[in-house]
């Protein structure tokens, strides 16, 4: 068991593999183009270490002619990756990454999906579809969520510190009582957040103080009981 | 594993005193509060008081103030608690606690009875 | 004292029911709890700590949930084994203080 005054409790939420994805099922899929896109680009939250799967407008591929993802990442070259029906070729240009692929044959499955999200595949993911009516598109912001791990100890005399490492976006910390608190934000070059929030609390029949943390990969709640303030030994409440 | 092991069952004549002992393993005695509770037969649990083994700071609940005594004995990680004055109404089963709450001791049985 | 109410105080069950029981702090006050489980004769023990944390070996039909200032302790679907007493504890303000309990009763 550690210290109490020491790292009392951490917490990192353990992720198997899931995968989330936006597609429609093959039932939705509509020969009225008018109709098919009610919105053309989506913001799309996911979780690292997940799998992703980005699909095209519900077009049936038999009115196609050409499909292309053109994926837009920070600090890397537009990369695009294209497929030709007539001729039945895939083209791939400035794409490096591995994990990006197309789900099966583009001729069978127009999807894209991402193996195992890591933070660098933040960015914009478009599906171009040209088809003999006019060019459909579908485009995503994929927003790369990365849960924090949540810290709370003790430092000194009935103060505080709750810390939410490396989340992505910065969670949210607050505090059971409400406390005499202070908060700093770090930014990290990968684009994580660490929230660290101090508090310290006068009144003394607050025995035990709460951490919450709200992230959007989900809310964490950590608790520790507060030293006694040194020479205090005996009181009544 | 956190245990706490409490003293047997005690009988005792009204205005007496009685001591629960409460021995605990598992986690590192002396940073950790230990709570004492009690409940009487068929009624709810109420709070007495705590301790941090630490530094010997102690709470006591109001209405046990003047009665009771806590104290902990680190080089055996036991915890004690004496109510002295006993009356028919401090019959009850005392628990002891440690880690927040989430350690019990089996409860001690005090009768008070003349 | 931040007192502690819970609801209802009994509760008439029958297995395959879906039981709820609540606890509010005085005043609204914010705090956090534990729920215990209480059987005749034995100790106290601990099913949901924190609010929500599920203690290791504990059901996975029992939960436990934060309203704002209210507690929930939830049994999806009851079993004969989960007829006792539960009741809450809250630990944010010395002197901690328990809810006066729920008993389960079979119909």
């Known amino acids: 068991q550690p210290n109490n005054s020491l790292m009392l409790q951490t917490s990192k939420e353990n992720h198997a593999l899931a995968s989330s994805s936006l597609c429609m099922d093959e039932k939705q899929i509509t020969q009225n183009y008018s109709k098919v896109l009610a919105e053309v680009n989506t913001s799309w939250p996911v979780k690292m270490a997940t799998n992703a799967v980005l699909c095209c407008p519900p077009i049936a591929l038999r009115n196609l002619i050409i499909i292309t993802w053109e994926i837009i990442l920070r600090g890397q070259p537009s990369c695009t990756k294209a497929y030709k029906k007539e001729t039945n070729e895939t083209k791939e240009t400035n794409c490096t990454d591995e994990r990006i692929t197309w789900v099966s044959r583009p001729d069978q499955n127009s999807d894209l999906q991402i193996r195992t999200v890591a933070i660098t595949h933040d960015g914009y993911y478009r599906c171009i579809m040209v088809t003999p009516d006019g060019n459909f598109h579908r485009g995503y912001h994929l927003q790369v969520l990365v849960t924090p791990e949540v810290t709370l100890f003790q430092n000194r005399n009935r103060t505080a510190v709750c810390k939410a490492v490396a989340g992505k976006p910065a969670a949210h910390i607050s505090w059971i009582p409400e406390g005499d608190c202070a908060t700093k934000q770090e930014y990290w070059s990968n684009g994580t957040v660490t929230v660290k929030s101090t508090c310290h609390w006068e009144v003394h029949n607050v025995s035990t103080v709460t951490c919450h943390v709200s992230h959007l990969t989900g809310n964490k709640s950590l608790y520790i009981e507060l030293l006694p303030v040194p020479g205090a030994k005996k009181s009544a409440k | 594993q956190v245990q706490l092991v409490q003293s047997g069952a005690e009988v005792k004549k009204p205005g007496a005193s009685v001591k629960v002992s409460c021995k605990a393993s598992g986690h590192t005695f002396t940073s950790y509060w230990m709570h004492w509770v009690r409940q009487a037969p068929g009624q709810g649990l109420e709070w007495i008081g705590n301790i941090y083994p630490g530094s010997g700071s102690i709470n006591y609940d109001e209405k046990f103030q003047g009665r009771v005594t806590m104290t902990v004995d680190t080089s055996t990680s036991t915890a004690y608690m004496e109510l002295s004055s006993l009356r028919s109404e401090d019959t009850a089963v005392y628990y002891c606690l440690t880690m927040t709450g989430t350690s019990w001791g089996r409860g001690t049985l005090v009768t008070v009875s003349s | 004292d931040v007192q502690m109410t819970q609801s209802p105080s009994s509760l008439s069950v029958s297995v395959g029911d879906r039981v709820t029981m609540t606890c509010q702090a005085s005043?609204?006050?914010?705090?956090?709890l534990h729920w215990f489980q209480q059987k005749p004769g034995k100790a106290p023990k601990l099913l949901i700590s924190?609010?929500?944390n599920l203690e290791d070996g504990v059901p996975s039909r029992f939960s436990g949930s934060r309203y704002g200032t209210a507690f929930t302790l939830t049994i999806s679907s009851l079993q004969d084994e989960d007829i006792a007493t539960y009741f809450c504890l809250q630990f944010t303000y010395i002197p901690w203080t328990f809810g006066q309990g729920t008993k389960l009763e079979i119909k």
């Open positions: 005043q609204g006050t914010p705090i956090n």
């Open positions: 924190g609010a929500s």
